[in-house]
Each structure stands twice: as structure tokens, then as C-alpha cells.
Amino acid sequence: LVVTPPGPELVLNVSSTFVLTCSGSAPVVWERMSQEPPQEMAKAQDGTFSSVLTLTNLTGLDTGEYFCTHNDSRGLETDERKRLYIFVPDPTVGFLPNDAEELFIFLTEITEITIPCRVTDPQLVVTLHEKKGDVALPVPYDHQRGFSGIFEDRSYICKTTIGDREVDSDAYYVYRLQVSSINVSVNAVQTVVRQGENITLMCIVIGNEVVNFEWTYPRKESGRLVEPVTDFLLDMPYHIRSILHIPSAELEDSGTYTCNVTESVNDHQDEKAINITVVESGYVRLLGEVGTLQFAELHRSRTLQVVFEAYPPPTVLWFKDNRTLGDSSAGEIALSTRNVSETRYVSELTLVRVKVAEAGHYTMRAFHEDAEVQLSFQLQINVPVRVLELSESHPDSGEQTVRCRGRGMPQPNIIWSACRDLKRCPRELPPTLLGNSSEEESQLETNVTYWEEEQEFEVVSTLRLQHVDRPLSVRCTLRNAVGQDTQEVIVVPHSLPFKV
């Protein structure tokens, strides 16, 4: 490329006309501020291409860079682009105007930047000042570019004197941006809503000062746009939140909501999604099975638990034999319903040191204006067995009887056993089980009674022994689901004068 005049810097008179020519082996074009001004392009007989730019009635605003470049798509090497800088000293123009974005200089690290205040006359003395300061800053000035150096975050102005008049530039704002990789988190006030209720989602990013949020959501696909609100949170630095609020949700608003966050300085981005379900009306659903018969052990604490899903949050009531239960002041009953996830609940009835009277029919009812569910079960209080009495007698018939009486819930089983060798029983010899078999020469009679008030069974068992010829250890063992109890008596033959 050949430019005439060659420059690289020209000082031209205001109101004059000036011609710039550029020629090359391929089509060429003049560019000014990324535009192509009107120019005459030609091709000579020797195959040389040229472009002539005529500058007429020059003013200070024509001051600036002019480029000649090849007018095709080939990559631009340094020799394929010629730069020319023209000054048109003009006392009516102070500082050359800047685009608004040139007044804000953003940087992400400590690096040299240029404050681009430029004048039309290369002979003018230009100084740089803090916006509110009079002292000129010791920063080098290039008439073609401006002041270059490392600047702190603050506002600056340039000053020059044209004739006897002091001229100030616009203020330039230097701002160091906080930029880091992006990590987005998205949450919703509720992920389940009823139609007509609001959907509110929040997208949060920490560690970046300037980011762009973009939401995609079901409503957007149908062309119904919602304007998100960006909030700069003050609880920690660089904490930015975008809020997407959809009033009066419809069933079609169910679906995936995605927040995409980009940071344009380093081109970082991240996105997160969340699913929202819009339901026609609220619901309450039991999760898992609870048996219709539940057990608790006397004097022990027992927690009965029901798990269910509901939206909106329900009211939960517990009943015993159709009477409403509440936390008792004596601390015998504790009721609690806790939210274990957005729509999942665990309701617990705790009976502290269970009493017999707490057996009965229990119901949990969970309800709201749209739905209800209830679950009932019978609570049985299990009472460990006790042997209340073990006695031996010899009626006139000559046989000997041993009577064992005990209580418990559920119904106790009774086991009789005997040991004939007192020295070795029960450590060395296992006791022999006694029953109704004739060879053991014993008979058994057992009666069971249920005591309604005490809610437990009483077992009375009588063991008849036909002839006892030597001392016999007889043991009565009562056993049920929650324990066992044993008592023992020594039965001696009629002929022996003593009984232990």
C-alpha cells in the first residue's frame, strides 16, 4: 500500500480542502472511524488499484485517524493497513467529542490504560487532573491518543488553554471491575404452586461485579415475556440476584426454568435450572404404610410417625377415641409436625412413659381447603408379664397341685418345667418340660381372662402331679412379646415331714 502524502502525521488548515490517495495491487479503501467515507476508486491500466479521499471544508472535527486498507476478505497483515493521523487545529473545538462508552474505562486487573482526551492542535499543552483537583498529574500525553498510564479508580478530566480560554474535557471514569469464574445457584420460593398463585425464582451469582442474566421459562416460549429484576445484595461483596416473578401462575407455567449468567469481560458463563409444578388444586397424600395395629410398651416412651406430602401446608390434628389431642402440660404427650422438604411432612405423636389408659383408637388428620387425608390405628399397650403367684397344695385326693397365676399383654404363654435332681438343676441338667402327656404323670389346666379396665390378660394354670416320690423343683415361666418372668417352688412327697 502506498499513501500520499505519506504522513504519518499531517497538520492541515481549518476550512481547507485536502486530497488523500492510496494505491495497491488489490482494491483499496479509506476508512474513518470504522466507516467508509465517500471516495473515488479506480483501476489503472497497469492493474494498480487506487482510492482518492477528498476532504473539503476541514474543521477540527476532522482530526483523527485515517486508514487505508485492502478492500477484500484476506487477512490484514501490517503492511496491508496504513495509518495516517490528521490534525486540523480549530480554536472553536476544544476536546474532540467522545462516545459515551469512551468516558467509562473498565478494567479487570492493574494494567496500563489510556484516557482518550484529544485536541485538534498538536501544539497545545494538555494536562490531566483528578476531577476535583487542580494539581496536574505526572502522566505522559500523546496528542494522537491521550494520557496513558496506570490509574486508580476515580474520575479524571483533561485541561488545555486555547488562546486565553481554559477548556475542560468531559470527565472520564476509571473503574476496576471484579471478575471471576461464574457459579450460579437457582432457587424458588416454592417449586409447587396452585394455579393463580405466584411463581418467584431467584438466581444468585457471587464474585462478579457486572453480569448479564438471561432466563428461559415455559411462558417465554409462547412469547409472553416477564421482566426480571436484578438486585445487588449488600450482605457480602459482589452478590447479585436476579428475581423472576410470574404472578397468577397457569398450568402451562409448569416446566423447567433456567437462569443463564454471562460475564462479558472474560466470557465466563454458567447456568442452572429448576423445575416448577403448577397444580390445579392442593393435595394431601400419605406416603408409606402404617399398620392398623400399633404397639407400645408400658412405662416406655413411644413415637408414632406418619409421613405425607401436601401443598399448601396443611393443618394436622391428632385424635384419640375421637377426642382432639394437644401437647399435655404434664409432658405426657408431645405432638409435632415438621416440614422435611418443601412438600413432605412428618407428623409425630410421642407418648412419654406410656400408661395403660393410653391404649385406644388414634387418628391423624391432615387437611387444608383443597384436600384432606386421615389415618387411623389401634394402639395396644404391651405389658411385660409378671408371675403374681406360684403355690403348691395337696388336696385329699392324694395328688399334688401347683397353681401359677400371672398377667401381661399380649396374652402370656405359660411353660411348666420340673427338675428332679436338685443338686444338678438347672445348671447341669435342663429342666423337663411338663404338659398333659400321661408319661409325665401330670395334668395341666389353664384359664385365660381379659381384664378390660387394666387392658391385660390374666393366666391361671394348675399343674396336677400324680405321685411325687422325691423332692421336685417345679418352675412356672410366663412369656409374651415383651418379656418373661419365672418363679419356682419345691414340691416334696407326702411322706417327707418338711418342704423347702
Epitope: 461485579e209 445487588f232 450482605d235 461483596p237 459482589y238
Partner: antibody, heavy 118, light 113 residues
């Protein structure tokens, strides 16, 4: 030129209420976080409350939480502090101040005096 | 909450001499990824609102004389007034703006000796 002008201060009995206002001009109101800072007579500065720019999230000092409410009207460029259940220890000059988000209080009003006494 | 403790509570310095005020933070106010310290120094004269002098712990506010300077780490900060002038008589406060609740130091009164 940034201007912040507080009003609404005055004399009030303990348990009473007062609403302070701050008229803002010379800057884009929603681009800045706004705060109330108070200074009891002869004492130091105490931050009271803040509201963020665009979204309007609110923050309070523990000493006023539940009693004071910060709010704003962006159409009028007004900042407010509703003070309820006032106590003698709330007696102070109340300043409104503006700050860029995550930045210092660059501009302050002249303050309005609130006196709580029986 | 971040507590700020200033020392001394008051300071008497001769004209033209140096005044040094310290501010200690109970936790760091340094944001590591950009090395910014979220601390500002204010000057307050009787009957006036506070005026910011130094922000980001060391950046002077436009129009503030260069005899005022700030320095510090993430938790220990210093405001220095080189060559104290009569008009510098005031109360000086540090304040953290790292996180709410924003907190101030208790103030340091600077007087002429």
C-alpha cells in the same frame, strides 16, 4: 450535583412513631444503595439500615430490627425510615447516605434530629 | 458482625507534625480475588456530616489533599495525616462496607497540641 435532604425529625415520646424522609437528586436513584446512619449527641456514628438499588432488598442493625422499616419511592427519588416503638436511646441526628453497591458512603445529607423523651 | 476498634481515642499533634490513627477489624475486610479492602476513612467536623477521605483503604477521594494517606492489610488499617494543618482538627472514623451490618470505629478526635 448530588443532593440528599432529610426531613421529618422532631420530638416524640417513648413508644411513639416518626417517619423520616430523604429527598435525593443529582444521580440515578436506583443505581445506588441508600442507608440511614445516626449519631447520638456527642457520640459516634451508627449504621441503622440500608436498601439496595434496583431490587430494594433491606438490611437493619440489630438495635432497630423489628421497629424500623426502610423503604423508598423510586418515582419520587425519596428514601424513608419509618420508626416505631421509639426509645430514649434512639435520640440522634439521622443522616441519609448514598453508596455505590459494595462501595463507601460517598454523599451524605445534613441530617435531621430525632429526640425521644418523656 | 465485624467490629472495628480505633486507637487512640484522641490525639494531640503539633502543626506540621504527623498524625497516625489505627483501625483494627475483628475479621478481614479484604476481598481476595481483587485485593480490594472494603474500608473507608471519614472526617467529621462539628455540626457537619462525615466526609469521605480515603476509600478502598488507600484510595484518596478526589479533592482530598495528598497529606492524607491510608494503608493496611485485611484487618489492620492506618490513616496518616502528614504535616497536620489547622483545618484537619476533626473526628476521624473508619467504616467497613464489606458486609451488612455496616460498622464504624468509635472515632478518634484529632486536636492541635
Amino acid at each position: 450535583q448530588v443532593q440528599l435532604v432529610e426531613s421529618g425529625g422532631g420530638f416524640v415520646q417513648p413508644g411513639g412513631s416518626l417517619r423520616l424522609s430523604c429527598a435525593a437528586s443529582g444521580f440515578t436513584f436506583t443505581n445506588y444503595a441508600m442507608s440511614w446512619v445516626r449519631q447520638a449527641p456527642g457520640k459516634g456514628l451508627e449504621w441503622v439500615s440500608a436498601i439496595s438499588g434496583v431490587g430494594g432488598s433491606t438490611y437493619y442493625a440489630d438495635s432497630v430490627k423489628g421497629r424500623f422499616t426502610i423503604s423508598r419511592d423510586t418515582s419520587k427519588n425519596m428514601l424513608y425510615l419509618q420508626m416505631n416503638s421509639l426509645r430514649a436511646e434512639d435520640t440522634a441526628v439521622y443522616y441519609c447516605a448514598k453508596a455505590p453497591h459494595w462501595g463507601p458512603f460517598g454523599s451524605w445529607g445534613q441530617g435531621t434530629l430525632v429526640t425521644v423523651s418523656s | 458482625d465485624i467490629q472495628l476498634t480505633q486507637s487512640p481515642d484522641s490525639l494531640a499533634v503539633s502543626l506540621g507534625e504527623r498524625a497516625t490513627i489505627n483501625c483494627k477489624s475483628s475479621q478481614s475486610v479484604l476481598y481476595r480475588s481483587n485485593n480490594k479492602k472494603f474500608l473507608v476513612w471519614y472526617q467529621q467536623k462539628p455540626g457537619q456530616p462525615p466526609k469521605p477521605l480515603i476509600y478502598w483503604a488507600s484510595t484518596r477521594e478526589s479533592g482530598v489533599p495528598d497529606r492524607f494517606s491510608g494503608s493496611g492489610s485485611g484487618t489492620d488499617f492506618t490513616l496518616t495525616i502528614n504535616s497536620l494543618q489547622a483545618e484537619d482538627v476533626a473526628v476521624y472514623y473508619c467504616q467497613q462496607y464489606y458486609s451488612t451490618p455496616y460498622t464504624f470505629g468509635q472515632g478518634t478526635k484529632v486536636e492541635i497540641k
